[in-house]
């Protein structure tokens, strides 16, 4: 043993759950990749935990993770990519509980941004396009894209659009009239890379016309 | 193998600047990790000076952070550390390092070059 | 900055003796730190990583523990070649600090 049970904190910390989730952001800054873990009961008594990961690395053996409050990572360029890296849970010299991990099952993609919505009034539609650091990116190239909508009244229907390119057309008759609408994107890896779903992009609002008395056709704003 | 080599004038006069070099074999300053520079004043212990990342970035220790400026020339695979109005307090042996960022340890290091500041 | 205390600044022990030498931090740094070997006129070289691990090449005699604030370094049996200035260093958070060393002399 390495000493740290003296007071009982080891003992006790057998105890405790210990489970905990990662994701991985590829060429996150530059050619850097970043992991990012976290205990999933937010209870846990942090204070001497720490993370590493051991196994598919570059040059390397292991990398100990940075702690900011409750979130553990590391960012560096020396994931292999290939093959499971072992992560756990360390208390001193002791590991409390380890996970295999494919770091290419476990991408978390950046959320898109510069959401916009443009009407044209001869089309009578709405043309949606957005933006994604991915397409500039080596690895994870292919997304899944999920554009949701809702009037901005109704508090949780929100319509879902998924699609894989960046640009997306709503027609004006499947909206409300004179309304105004919310939307937002968001990714997720759709091609030898998997993982979870991005953080949501910034929301967009935009007004639909009202309906044109004589044409019965909305006006546009 | 990787190897360092510190390179430049041993003595160097009070108020001008000191200049070191660095070349680096067996690896190259493009591909990963931070490359510092560290240095001993005479008979005492070790201080960090700064790096430069691969991705060209730099971080100085605050201490010294209006004096440095450490660059690089990749077509040489080599880093420079520049350190402006020097004071008989900079004497010291400079060294060159890899290591650091992500890594918690220098592995490999430059044999050092002593730098005399004196009129 | 974070201060690295490092005891004692010497020590004389016999070949065979086992060596200790502890380092302090000033706050938390989890396993980011090193020990180093230097010996009169030459660079330090690196002996244990993340606060425990031994690097390439170094004998096993020597070990390190320790997490969070409180490091040692061990030298199971000490060695002729043993006989140098042992320091440790924190990555942890910039600057990157060393402590003051320790000179192991022959008794």
């Known amino acids: 043993e390495s000493g740290y049970a003296q007071n009982g904190d080891l003992e006790d910390a057998e105890l405790d759950d210990y489970s905990f989730s990662c994701y991985s952001q590829l060429e996150v800054n530059g050619s850097q990749h970043s992991l990012t873990c976290a205990f999933e009961d937010p209870d846990v008594n942090i204070t001497n935990l720490e993370f590493e990961i051991c196994g598919a690395l570059v040059e390397v053996k292991c990398l100990n993770f940075r702690k900011l409050q409750e979130i553990y990572f590391i960012e560096t360029k020396k994931f292999l990519l290939i093959g499971k890296s072992n992560i756990c849970v360390k208390v001193g010299e002791k590991s409390l509980t380890c996970k295999k991990i494919d770091l290419t099952t476990i991408v978390k993609p950046e959320a898109p941004f510069d959401l916009s919505v443009v009407y044209r009034e001869g089309a009578n539609d709405f043309v949606v396009t957005f933006n994604t650091s991915h397409l500039q990116k080596k690895y994870v190239k292919v997304l899944m894209h999920d554009v949701a909508y809702r009037q901005e009244k109704d508090e949780n229907k929100w319509t879902h659009v998924n699609l894989s390119s960046t640009k997306l057309t709503l027609l004006q008759r499947k909206l409300q009239p004179a309304a105004m609408y919310e939307i937002k994107v968001r990714s997720i890896p759709d091609h030898y890379f998997k993982g979870f779903w991005s953080e949501w992009s910034p929301s967009y609002y935009f007004r639909t016309p009202e309906i044109n008395n004589s044409s019965g056709e909305m006006d546009p704003i | 193998q990787v190897q360092l080599q510190e390179s430049g004038p041993g003595l160097v006069k009070p108020s001008e600047t000191l200049s070191l070099t660095c070349t680096v074999s067996?690896?190259?300053?493009?591909?990963?990790?931070?490359w510092n520079w560290i240095r001993q004043p005479p008979g005492k212990g070790l201080e960090w000076i700064g790096y430069?990342?691969?991705?060209?970035?730099?971080t100085y220790t605050p201490s010294l952070k209006s004096r440095i400026t450490i660059s690089r020339d990749t077509s040489k695979n080599q880093f420079s550390l520049k350190l402006s109005s020097v004071t008989a307090a900079d004497t010291a042996v400079y060294y060159c390092?890899?290591?650091?960022?992500?890594?918690?340890?220098?592995?490999?290091w430059g044999q050092g070059t002593t730098v005399t500041v004196s009129s | 900055d974070i201060q690295m205390l490092q005891s004692p600044s010497s020590l004389s022990a016999s070949v065979g003796d086992r060596v200790t030498i502890t380092c302090l931090a000033s706050?938390?740094?989890?396993?980011?730190l090193a020990w180093y070997q230097q010996k009169p006129g030459k660079a330090p070289k690196l002996l244990i990583y993340?606060?425990?691990r031994l690097a390439d090449g170094v004998p096993s005699r020597f070990s390190g523990s320790g997490s969070g604030t409180m490091f040692t370094l061990t030298i199971s049996s000490l060695q002729p070649e043993d006989f140098a200035t042992y320091y440790c260093?924190?990555?942890?958070?910039?600057?990157?600090?060393f402590g003051g060393g320790t000179k192991v002399e022959i008794k």
């Open positions: 390092a890899r290591g650091g960022y992500d890594v918690n340890y220098f592995d490999y």
């Open positions: 993340a606060a425990t």
């Open positions: 706050q938390t740094i989890g396993y980011w």
């Open positions: 430069i990342f691969y991705s060209g970035s730099t």
């Open positions: 067996g690896y190259s300053v493009t591909t990963d990790y931070a």
């Open positions: 260093q924190q990555f942890f958070s910039y600057p990157w600090t």
